[in-house]
């Protein structure tokens, strides 16, 4: 699916949102120094404002002396392994003036018997050892440090934490007589937690688990026990919270029914069932309290474990994630597509936007894409006019303004963001599509009708006519 | 230290409901998961449910539900269990307590507990 | 629910006696993922509120004397005082942390003679 797409800049982009952290001095590890306002009291945005474009222009000269690259640090800790025993690693990118620290989990689909896990290991080796791991990684969307392509969190410490488990981010059971391959998962992250806390986590103010697909499912598995092992280890005033992409997934019912026989057409409620079980996959306690012996599998859906959490997150989901639709057994080929497939991608949608009703702090775009948080041009996308950056900042804000407890909004700073337009590429800031065929860049209208999508159907509940429709899809409006 | 300070006792009429309030000390009250534990005489004790001050969620034992509500007031690091259409039933003593760690409750820290007498 | 039986009801021992206090839940309380059985057990004496022995089965709570042991698996779990002494009379509750809804068993009411 990665060919089908590519991701394109604006040509106007909205203003970056505001900093929301300041490029410390040279050689001082602070981030903040008290100022006396009272001269600008009157006019502070546009103080600030000043404050923030003097910074911006300053930082170029910083910049030059940057090296964008995470480096490999292996973990110490040799009993924590991939899947085949070679020790699991991180990526780390050190930012001393900060005390953020964003630690993000790969995703890459998983394996949930010997056998694909055997052919797993012939293809994508790279997901199941760390043989080949390359000494460094360049940092990119939210990983970046550079604040045009990460206007949220380019000054905070940036650890990438590679995918090697293939249990997404569950597994507690290592390689054994028994067992052929090694499912750590879970035991990876804790271990990684546990060696940053001697490379400067100590120090930090907020710890954000992030990750997309695989990943970001693994944040949802995770989040709570990294809050719980940072209380025991005696760091309890480190914020832990969640940023889950492309990882909330629906058991949904399939579009065609499979038996499980590969990773890609088992239905999921049977690949997490019968992984869990290969794994010894551990999920959050709370939620696993609420349901049977055997039955542990419904923790690895979002909209089932996300109302047991204690830590904050927010949740990115494209409503017509390509992996969902894929797990569904929906195949967009580009043969026309039948109504009854069509009725079952926008059913998809709007169950995922049922779901996300009470998450108040979400970003889902109308668009048939996955992933995107690590994406270079992850600032493009827009709902409701905010980007995903500017979301986030304004999470941050209400997390700090509210102490965390009072749910009123922030004035002029969404959270909550949620398409409402009931089709893929409805939303004119999706990621342009690409033809899979010919490679051509496709417009909104061409996509949909490509699709199958008569404009008549999509045209008619909007109260318009088919020809104003298109004029409006191909003016982006 | 920690510490969970509730009222000594409260006398009310069948059918009235009554708000029992706990009122945590010593620890981060937004932090931590507060239940409500209802003892009778030789009844053994039952949990009644569990919230987290944090963002209100709240996890009930069914055979309580409709009978208590949980809340907090994180201002005032308070928690409180409302108890509805009363009956002599109702009459125990309840406790607020709360878990060593976030996730795992046996229950370290407990309130002195609250005697109410359901009576006409 | 999962179900947490005591026995016995009550039992008197003499000071410097050993006792065994029986709790057998309806399920399994061991998960397998960790290997942790998930009970806890608790001392109420007379007036007062419970107080946390041993969690974890067999993990004592730190500043609980060694004469209390906790012990066993999966559905039968097992309270030793090793040599009984006054200040233990109290209502011994056993608790699973298992699975909603947390439940507790009938106690046991240790008497001294």
């Known amino acids: 699916s990665e060919g089908r797409k590519t991701w394109r800049r604006r040509g106007q982009q909205p203003p970056p949102p505001p900093r929301t952290e300041a490029a410390p001095a040279a050689g001082q590890p602070v981030e903040s120094f008290p100022l006396d306002f009272t001269a600008v009291e009157g006019n502070m945005d546009s103080f600030m404002a000043q404050v923030k474009s003097l910074a911006q222009s300053l930082y170029p000269c910083s910049a030059q002396q940057l090296n964008e690259d995470l480096r490999l640090h292996l973990l110490l800790n040799t009993s924590v392994t991939c899947n085949d025993g070679s020790p699991a690693g991180y990526y780390l990118k050190e930012s001393r003036g900060s005390r953020r620290w964003l630690l993000f989990l790969e995703g890459g689909w998983y394996c949930f018997n010997r056998e694909n896990c055997d052919s797993r290991y012939d293809t994508m080796r790279r997901l199941m050892s760390s043989r080949d791991w390359p000494r460094t990684r360049t940092g990119t969307g939210i990983l970046s440090s550079q604040p045009e392509e990460n206007p949220y969190w380019w000054n905070a410490n940036m650890v990438f934490i590679p995918y090697c488990s293939s249990d997404v981010w569950s597994g507690a059971s290592s390689k054994s007589e028994k067992n052929e391959y090694a499912f750590m998962g879970a035991l990876i992250i804790q271990e990684v937690v546990r060696e940053l806390l001697g490379r400067g986590l100590s120090g930090a103010k907020v710890l954000l688990l992030a990750g997309s697909s695989a990943g970001g499912t693994g944040v949802l598995l995770n989040v709570d026990r990294v809050a719980e092992q940072l209380e025991k280890l005696g760091y309890p005033a480190i914020q832990v919270r969640g940023l889950a992409d492309s990882g909330w997934f629906l058991d949904n019912k399939q579009y065609r029914h499979t038996d499980c026989v590969d990773t890609i057409t088992c239905a999921p409620t049977e690949a997490i069932r019968r992984g869990i079980r290969y794994w010894n996959g551990v999920v959050p306690e709370r939620c696993r309290r609420q349901f049977q012996e055997g039955e542990e599998w419904n923790c690895f859906f979002g909209y089932k474990v996300y109302p047991t959490l204690r830590c904050p997150v927010f949740v990115v989901q494209w409503l017509f994630d390509e992996a969902q639709l894929t797990v569904d057994n929906v195949h967009l080929t580009g043969q026309p597509v039948q109504e009854g497939l069509r009725l079952y991608i926008q059913n998809l949608g709007r169950e995922l936007r049922h779901t996300l009703k009470d998450v108040p702090a979400s970003f889902a775009p109308a668009c048939l894409s996955h992933e995107i948080i690590i994406r270079s041009h992850w600032t493009d996308v827009q709902v409701k006019g905010t980007s995903l950056p500017r979301a986030l900042h304004c999470w941050d804000r209400s997390l700090h303004d509210s102490h965390k407890a009072s749910k009123t909004p922030l004035k002029g700073c969404p959270v909550h963001l949620v398409d409402s337009c009931p089709w893929p590429h409805c939303n004119p800031s999706c990621p342009t599509v690409r033809d899979q065929f010919t490679g051509q860049e496709m417009n909104v209208a061409q996509f949909l009708m490509h699709m199958g999508f008569d404009m008549q159907t999509v045209a008619q509940p909007q109260g318009l006519e088919p020809s104003e429709l298109l004029g409006m899809l191909s003016n982006g409006s | 230290q920690v510490q969970l300070l509730q009222p000594g006792s409260v006398l009310v009429r069948p059918g009235a409901s009554v708000k029992l309030s706990c009122k945590a000390s010593g620890y981060t009250f937004t932090s931590y998961w507060m239940h409500w534990v209802k003892r009778r005489p030789g009844q053994g004790l039952e949990w009644i449910g569990e919230i987290y001050p944090n963002n209100g969620r709240t996890t009930y034992n069914e055979k309580f539900k409709g009978k208590a509500t949980l809340t907090v007031d994180t201002s005032s690091s308070t928690a409180y269990v409302d108890l509805s259409s009363l009956t002599s039933e109702d009459s125990a003593v309840y406790s607020c307590?709360?878990?060593?760690?976030?996730?795992?409750?046996?229950?370290?820290?407990w309130g002195q507990g609250t005697l109410v007498t359901v009576s006409a | 629910d999962i179900m947490m039986s005591q026995s016995p009801s009550s039992l008197a021992v003499s000071v410097g006696e050993k006792v065994t206090l029986s709790c057998k839940s309806s399920q399994s309380l061991l998960y397998s993922s960790n290997q942790k059985n998930y009970v806890a057990w608790y001392q109420q004496k007379p007036g007062q509120s419970p107080k946390v022995l041993i969690y974890?089965?067999?993990t004592r709570e730190s500043g609980v004397p060694d004469r209390f042991t906790g012990s066993g698996s999966g559905t039968d779990f097992t309270l030793t005082i090793s040599s009984v002494k006054a200040e233990d009379l109290a209502v011994y509750h056993c608790?699973?942390?298992?699975?909603?809804?947390?439940?507790f068993g009938g106690g046991t009411k240790l008497e001294i003679k």
């Open positions: 307590a709360r878990g060593l760690y976030y996730d795992y409750d046996w229950f370290a820290y």
């Open positions: 608790q699973q942390y298992y699975r909603y809804p947390y439940t």
């Open positions: 974890w089965a067999s």
